[in-house]
């Protein structure tokens, strides 16, 4: 999903002055940064989250907060420390004048400061319900009583926890952090205050219309009666969950965040920390008919981000807007006219729509999967959700053209059996953010911490790119794509897989002088080829068109253009076997595909030859897709011939382990 630097407003204040004689001035050359929501109406100036550097202790946080207050007081400003964070992120929440930002950014330990902003419930119209008859018949859907080993935390509005549909299933915690309702004449009507949360609790675990009928839930109130909350309130809620987890460790935890605000670095960071503590976070993609990467927590890579589809598996339209989309969405789920508990009465049901409802479905599915396999990691759970989804059923024409390739065509589904998927080699495709158009621009795609990067490819709509390569970054491989002069930008595409006990490395061959092209193979004993990448420095590979042929009987070899450096991803893992599958079309084609057979998983996807009329290659589920320029611009020369190269792998070790369990 989103890289560290997203599309949000960043105000970097390079402050070097030593005024106030700070005893612990920031290290030379480091500059704390200020961030605020890019959506102006959602900004909450006057309240700021001051995030301190990672290893800062609670006592240092408190000292820094006191120092800020003292220095502000010397300037005649009143400040109020509203909360000191610890457990998830070090820092504090302060109410102060924006005039003090310069001062605050110079404090010791400060990493960045973010202005508070609003978050919103993602159901429409959640407080203008179309009441259905109080009796709802669930004859069609009777899932097993599932999710009983899992606790689902819901961060939402208040909820009517004794509604017949959810009675005894939801524990209302004493956590509440909500802003005042807008408008002087706002009338707090209990049933409206509870509407959003009650419905979602019913979708997750309701007796009649719930997905995981056995799941128990805990609710935290972070949204007010108008369905509005704050980033800071959500942060404090996430911290509350982490502290609860530390005080009383239970089984697997799922956190449902059916809300969205503008891109927030701090909210994404908190989600990352909680996810790395073993918590599964599920969030709404947002109802703005926009790129989900512009919203939080939807843009946090560690969060499972869910878009909404209807009964016909089409993206949900909500008034003039609709479900969000793009590379930050992991999958879609039902989110239109979803029946669930209504807070209008203790036995009423209602239909609501939105990405909140879609996220609640996935939280329920996650609870059932985790109840069946409590040891699943977040990466394993995400891969299973993707694997068991219905593929290629969404009509992509609804999405903006430039988002279609980035948006996963996946609709969540319960696995046919919650056990027995362990033998599969699971892989998913991760797209980077767009690089931007500058000559040296690059884009980076990363896998989750416990996934292996098995291959790397790139894509550019203009075709002007300089390929891609796998490189080490912070002890882990990443996929980096390179833009070319005159290009409009590139995407890096990582193929991220679950491969236990894997030992992977990248072998590189520099550009060859010989006319046969560049080749590289996996020479280490027991290592197999999982992916090929090529990267070149020249602006246009199309000026040299040598025939590039893969020598017969060389499955462990990558070949490419003689002016490109070629990178082979070579992995050793118990029982791992891979094979190369190619599909070449002699005539020019805008798209060439090759798929792996049943039982095999696509790990690598690349194009031969790597000439400039090839826009790039990427994996869609188990199919390798190679895109070329519009055939009308290439003509029917030999340059139009393109081969899609798929590397298909399976793990005999995983299959054997699964058989032993059964």
């Amino acid at each position: 999903q989103e890289d560290e630097d997203g599309d949000y407003e960043e105000l970097v204040l390079a402050l070097r002055s030593e005024e106030d004689g700070l005893a612990e001035a920031p290290e030379h050359g480091t500059t704390a940064t200020f961030h605020r929501c890019a959506k102006d109406p959602w900004r909450l100036p006057g309240t700021y989250v001051v995030v301190l550097k990672e290893e800062t202790h609670l006592s240092q946080s408190e000292r820094t907060a006191r120092r800020l207050q003292a220095q502000a007081a010397r300037r005649g400003y009143l400040t109020k420390i509203l909360h000191v964070f610890h457990g998830l992120l070090p820092g504090f929440l302060v109410k102060m004048s924006g005039d003090l930002l310069e001062l605050a950014l110079k404090l010791p330990h400060v990493d960045y400061i973010e202005e508070d902003s609003s978050v919103f419930a993602q159901s429409i119209p959640w407080n203008l319900e179309r009441i259905t008859p109080p009796r709802y018949r669930a004859d069609e859907y009777q899932p097993p009583d599932g999710g009983s080993l899992v606790e689902v935390y819901l961060l939402d509005t208040s909820i009517q926890s004794d509604h017949r549909e959810i009675e005894g299933r939801v524990m209302v915690t004493d956590f509440e952090n909500v802003p005042e309702e807008d408008g002087t004449r706002f009338h707090r009507q209990a049933s409206k205050c509870d509407s959003h949360g009650t419905h979602l609790a019913g979708v997750v675990s309701g007796r009649d219309a719930g997905v995981a009928k056995g799941a128990s839930m805990r609710s935290l109130r972070v949204l007010n009666c108008q369905g509005k909350g704050t980033v800071s309130g959500t942060l404090i809620g996430l911290e509350f969950i982490r502290k609860s987890q530390l005080v009383q460790p239970v089984g697997p935890l799922v956190v449902l965040l059916p809300l969205a605000g503008g891109y927030s670095r701090v909210l994404n960071a908190a989600c990352q920390r909680l996810a790395r503590a073993g918590v599964v976070l599920v969030t709404a993609a947002g109802n703005f008919r926009d790129d989900a990467c512009l919203y939080s927590p939807a843009s946090a890579p560690e969060v499972i981000t869910v878009g909404a589809t209807n009964a016909q598996d089409q993206p949900v339209t909500l008034g003039t807007l609709g479900t969000n989309f793009g590379r930050c969405v992991d999958l879609f789920a039902p989110g239109e006219d979803i029946i669930g508990a209504s807070s209008d009465c203790s036995t009423c049901f209602v239909s609501q729509s939105g990405t909140s409802q879609a996220a609640a479905h996935v939280a329920g599915i996650a609870a059932m999967m985790l109840s069946a396999e409590p040891e699943l990691t977040l990466a394993e759970l995400r891969q299973r959700l993707i694997h068991f989804s219905a593929k290629d059923v969404i009509n992509e024409a609804w999405f903006p053209e430039d988002q279609r390739v980035l948006t996963p065509n996946l609709v969540a589904a319960l696995p046919p059996s919650t056990h027995g998927a362990g033998w599969q080699l699971f892989c998913r495709t991760v797209w980077s953010a767009h690089s931007g158009p500058t000559r040296m621009a690059t884009a980076v795609a990363r896998c989750a911490p416990d996934e292996e990067l098995l291959s790397c490819s790139s894509f550019s709509r203009s075709g002007k790119r300089r390929g891609e390569r796998m490189e080490a970054q912070g002890g882990k491989l990443v996929c980096r794509a390179h833009n070319a002069f005159g290009g409009e930008g590139v995407y890096a595409i990582a193929r991220c897989c679950l491969l236990p006990q894997a030992n992977c490395s990248v072998h590189t061959a520099p550009p060859a002088e010989a006319s046969m092209g560049t080749r590289v193979h996996c020479h280490q004993q027991g290592h197999v080829l999982t992916g090929c990448s090529s990267h070149w420095e020249v602006e246009d590979l199309g000026t040299h068109k040598p025939p590039v042929l893969r020598p017969r009987g060389q499955p462990n070899q990558c070949v490419g253009h003689r002016e490109a450096s070629i990178h082979a991803s070579c992995c050793h893992a118990p029982g791992l076997e891979c094979k190369v599958k190619e599909h070449g079309i002699p005539a020019p084609q805008e798209q060439v595909t090759v798929a792996c057979e049943e039982g095999w998983t696509l790990t690598g996807c690349s194009a031969l030859p790597g000439t400039s009329h090839v826009l790039g290659a990427y994996a869609v589920d188990n199919t390798c897709v190679v895109r070329s320029r519009d055939v009308s611009t290439t003509g029917s020369t030999s340059e139009g011939a393109v081969t899609a190269v798929a590397i298909c792998c399976r793990s005999r070790h995983l299959a054997q382990a699964s058989q032993e369990l059964q």
Partner: antibody, heavy 115, light 107 residues
């Protein structure tokens, strides 16, 4: 552990009112409402209604015809059932039970209506 | 209101017998059905909820089945402490309604 403790037996004259209490403990109060059920001597069980500890909302059986009121006091974890204009056929054991699902019951309160 | 019809209204059985009590709803109640056991002078005790789920502490000889309109309570091997009156109850719709009860007596 979950407990529902009801008030003691009552003897009332026809036309009078009775108020039975039910003190709940051992669970998250707001996660369940309280159902009231009565059982006339030698007869079966009859559901009278339900009341919420969360927001005080209630749900009555039609048969009570406005004679009954169910309330809760979250501060004392107590639910109340008041029955007015008592008649001899209101003689029964009155039970409180947890939630619509009635998974835990009070010990019962005997109400005798006699002139 | 949803009518709940229990049968038989009473039965005589011996210790060790397999006993089956049925309950029929006048309309579909999905699985929103509970079974209770009541002994003289005591409050009812929940035996089965959601048509087939046994709460903690209820002996495994008690089992429930059915969905929609027809439900069954089975006691696989009757024990001396099982002689009591059994009620089914629906909570699919308000008002919640009970069956008229089945009295299980010693033969």
């Amino acid at each position: 552990q979950v407990q529902l403790v009801q008030s003691g037996a009552e003897v009332k004259k026809p036309g009078a009112s009775v108020k039975v209490s039910c003190k709940a403990s051992g669970y998250s109060l707001t996660s369940y409402g309280i159902s009231w059920v009565r059982q006339a001597p030698g007869q079966g069980l009859e559901w009278m209604g339900w009341v919420s500890f969360y927001n005080g909302n209630s749900n009555y059986a039609q048969k009570l015809q406005g004679r009954g009121t169910m309330t809760t006091d979250p501060s004392t974890s107590t639910a109340y059932m008041e029955l007015r204009s008592l008649r001899s056929d209101d003689t029964a054991v009155y039970y409180c039970a947890r939630g619509f699902g009635m998974d835990r019951w009070g010990q019962g309160t005997t109400v005798t209506v006699s002139s | 209101d949803i009518q709940m019809t229990q049968s038989p209204s009473s039965l005589s059985a011996s210790v060790g017998d397999r006993v089956t009590i049925t309950c029929r709803a006048s309309q579909n109640i999905n699985n929103w059905l509970n079974w209770y056991q009541q002994k003289p002078g005591k409050a009812p005790k929940l035996l089965i909820y959601g048509a087939s789920t046994r709460p903690t502490g209820v002996p495994s000889r008690f089992s429930g089945s059915g969905s929609g309109t027809d439900f069954t309570l089975t006691i696989s091997s009757l024990q001396p402490e099982d002689f009591a009156t059994y009620y089914c109850q629906q909570w699919d719709d308000t008002p919640n309604t009970f069956g008229q009860g089945t009295k299980v007596e010693i033969k």
